[in-house]
Structures are given as C-alpha cells and as structure tokens.
Amino acid sequence: LQEKIEEIAAKYKHLVVKKCCYDGVRINHDETCEQRAARISVGPRCVKAFTECCVVASQLRANNSHKDLQLGR
C-alpha cells in the first residue's frame, strides 16, 4: 500500500496537493471517499489527489483483506 501511494504522490509536486493525497489514505470506515472529498475547499487539485489516493488505498485494503480471508480458509 505504502509503495503504491508513494508512487501516486510522487506525481504531485505541490506539497499541499501531495498532502491531500496522503489525507485520502487515512482509514475512515464511516464515509466513502466521495463523501470525504466533498468537504475539501482548497481546490479541485486537492479533491482529485485525495480521491485518487483514497480510492486506490481502499481497493488495496479490500484486496488484502480478501486474500487474508482466502488464506484463512
């Protein structure tokens, strides 16, 4: 997960945009990525970076938990 997120974040050369990406990686079981992104007001660049990293992180976590379940069987 960390490697993939670092790969994505490396595209963003504006520090705030990069940090928006990292914010998207934080675990939040109560809201979707879209719901969280809707509260961002600093600009569409931040929304895009946040959403991209949030979605990728969510997918990777889902895949990993799925693998864990398979191994558990």
């Epitope: 504006h14 520090l15 705030v16 007001s41 600093v42 660049r45």
Partner: antibody, heavy 118, light 111 residues
Framework: QVQLVQSGAEVKKPGSSVKVSCKAS????????IHWMRQAPGQGLEWMGY????????NYNENFKGRVTITADKSTSTAYMELSSLRSEDTAVYYC???????????WGQGTTVTVSS | DIVLTQSPASLAVSPGQRATITCKAS??????????MNWYQQKPGQPPKLLIY???NLDSGVPARFSGSGSGTDFTLTINPVEAEDTANYYC?????????FGGGTKVEIK
C-alpha cells in the same frame, strides 16, 4: 470583499528578526493557502513560502535556509511571516497573497517595506 | 525548480500598437491538459495584479485587450491595442509545483 491587510513598515538592524502580519477578511480564512513573496528595490518577485491555515501545512523556498517561518492564527484570520538573521540584502517589500484553487494568486496584500540597516 | 525566462526585458510600444511578451519554462507546466501558468501586472508602488490565469483565462475586470496563449513550456501575453495606462511591469508565474517561481519581469513603456 476579500482583503489582505499587512502590518506597517519596519526598520531593522542586521542580525535581528522581523515579523510581518497579513490579516484576511471577506472570505473563510481556512479555505485558501496564503503565500509570501518579496521584492527587492528595482527587482523582480521572489517566492518565500506558504501556509495552508486549515491544516497548518507549510512549505518554504530553500534559498532562505531555514531563516523564514510562516504561521497562521485561525482565531484572528491572520498569517505571519518571520524572517531571522536579517542582512542588508533582505531590504525589500514583502507581500502576502491568497492562492485560489491551488492555481493562482487572486488577492494580494498592499505590501510591507522592511529596511535592514545598521 | 522550474525556471521561467521572460523576454524581452523591456519594450516601448506606441499607443494602439501590439505588445507581445513571452515566457519560456525550463520544463512543462502542463498537467493533464491544464497549464499552470499565470500573468500579473505591477504598477509602481502597487502589489501585482492578476491578469491571466491557466495560460489563457482573463481574470474578471481585466480589459479584453489583454490575452494569453501557449501551452507546455512556451507562453505569450499580448496587449492589443496598448493604452497609456498599460505602462507597468509584467510577470509570468507557475503554480504547478513548489517552489512557485516567477519570470524576471518585462517593463512595458508607452512611447
């Protein structure tokens, strides 16, 4: 209407520090990044750094080698720029500006003249 | 760092004529089709004022005689026709990445 109002002119001795303020009004202070630039007499614009008040995130121009610190007080909607170890070459007009959409500077402060002289 | 090179450093234009200023970036400021290049006008004793953002978008209240064009690494600010009040310094600026950088400026004088 959006306004950025900066503190008044300063005269400082070499080796001392200066702290310039930038009070924002007319918009939600935490929604936009505040940048600081400076302009030496007869010269162009030099970017110094910024702060995103909502998160406290900062980034600085490496040319200032740790001499610059940017802070923000959300309770008063004011950003501050402190420059230490002043030298004569730091004599300049210092500007704050709001960055809109992480794209461009749409509002600027009126500028603060800092003179460094022994 | 992205270095912005403006030319010419100064130019004198007669009223009614066209003034053209160029800004060349050391690397592309285009990201996914959006050009993070802006233009500002600065008159003596005043802060800079936004003219053009995203390479070609005129800021509100800016006269239509100002226009911007270009993409990637090469950008142009055009004033046509020039008026006496356009005497000022003009700066390009990129916001794609940190550190944000400005061009060296172009001084426009009216003959």
């Amino acid at each position: 209407q959006v306004q950025l109002v900066q503190s008044g002119a300063e005269v400082k001795k070499p080796g001392s520090s200066v702290k310039v303020s930038c009070k924002a009004s007319g918009y939600t202070f935490t929604d936009h990044i505040i940048h600081w630039m400076r302009q030496a007499p007869g010269q162009g614009l030099e970017w110094m750094g910024y702060i995103y008040p909502r998160e406290g995130w900062t980034n600085y121009n490496e040319n200032f080698k740790g001499r610059v610190t940017i802070t923000a007080d959300k309770s008063t909607s004011t950003a501050y720029m402190e420059l230490s170890s002043l030298r004569s070459e730091d004599t300049a007009v210092y500007y704050c500006a709001r960055e809109r959409n992480l794209e461009y500077f749409d509002y600027w402060g009126q500028g603060t003249t800092v003179t460094v002289s022994s | 760092d992205i270095v912005l090179t403006q030319s010419p450093a100064s130019l004198a234009v007669s009223p009614g004529q066209r003034a053209t200023i160029t800004c060349k970036a050391s690397q592309s400021v285009d990201y996914e089709g959006f050009n993070y290049m802006n233009w500002y006008q600065q008159k003596p004793g005043q802060p800079p004022k936004l003219l053009i953002y995203a390479a070609s978008n005129l800021d509100s209240g800016v006269p239509a005689r100002f226009s911007g064009s270009g993409s990637g690494t090469d950008f142009t600010l055009t004033i046509n026709p020039v008026e006496a009040e356009d005497t000022a310094n003009y700066y390009c600026q990129q916001s794609l990445e940190d550190p944000h950088t400005f061009g060296g400026g172009t001084k426009v004088e009216i003959k």
